[in-house]
Interface confidence: low
């Protein structure tokens, strides 16, 4: 495919990535699928600077990111290494809390009202952020 050199309409460019900020809520899996259908992924936060950028745009609202531990260890959806990467958990989090009464623990990460991360039940209908990198090959065929 061709390389994407500018962001799609209604996406925000920042540091060679494009971001789309939802204004409605979906379960984590549905949000993940939405981003994939846009040839993107749920946002992967790799630095303080990116954390602040996203936080500025989402405000004090619970918002899904591309981090989960549904298969055991914490993983970023784009393969970024979790152990050596940036982390912004609230103190005492993640705690895989079982006391919510919804069955199971908490396997999906979201931004909380102050920007810090929390793990929560993946079925909760939170807003979400999609991200795609500029200069990566687009899935769309090139124009002839």
């Amino acid at each position: 495919g061709s390389e994407r050199t500018c962001c799609p309409v209604n996406w925000v460019e920042h540091e060679r990535s494009c971001y789309w900020f939802s204004r409605s809520g979906k379960a984590w899996a549905d949000a993940d699928n939405y981003c994939r259908l846009e040839d993107a992924h749920l946002v992967v936060v790799t630095s303080w600077e990116e954390q602040k950028f996203v936080q500025h745009h989402i405000g004090p609202v619970n918002t899904w990111m591309g981090l989960h531990d549904q298969n055991g260890p914490w993983k970023w959806v784009d393969g970024t290494d979790y152990e050596t990467g940036f982390k912004n958990w609230r103190p005492e989090q993640p705690d895989d809390w079982y006391g919510h009464g919804l069955g199971g623990g908490e396997d999906c990460a979201h931004f909380t009202d102050d920007g810090r991360w929390n793990d929560d039940v993946c079925q909760r209908p939170y807003r979400w952020v999609c991200e795609t990198e500029l200069d990566k090959a687009s899935q769309e065929p090139p124009l002839l």
Partner: nanobody
Framework: EVQLLESGGGLVQPGGSLRLSCAAS????????MMWVRQAPGKGLEWVSD????????YYADSVKGRFTISRDNSKSTLYLQMNSLRAEDTAVYYC?????????????WGQGTLVTVSS
Amino acid sequence: EVQLLESGGGLVQPGGSLRLSCAASGFTFSRYGMMWVRQAPGKGLEWVSDIAPDGRGTYYADSVKGRFTISRDNSKSTLYLQMNSLRAEDTAVYYCAKMMPTSTVSFDYWGQGTLVTVSS
């Protein structure tokens, strides 16, 4: 060698104010998040507040939100904690700490602490 030297603690009456300082050396201060933690008598370490490397991202524990303000002066390699409306439960040894580069929760160096006593 990383060094963090806290100062500014002391005895203050309930409702009073103090400003803690932390002078840092031995590392590039402007590249790291910094935090304040405290340890009350007979208790464990409690996170109080922290601040992004450029000073624009600040976070507070619920117990101090609206009363404490964290700030930093990168030109002086100094971290501050302005503490207002102090309460007896704020009595503790306050430590400044250098955050690890890949985390805003973990720290790898901390100072010797400064004692804050809130009592009438």
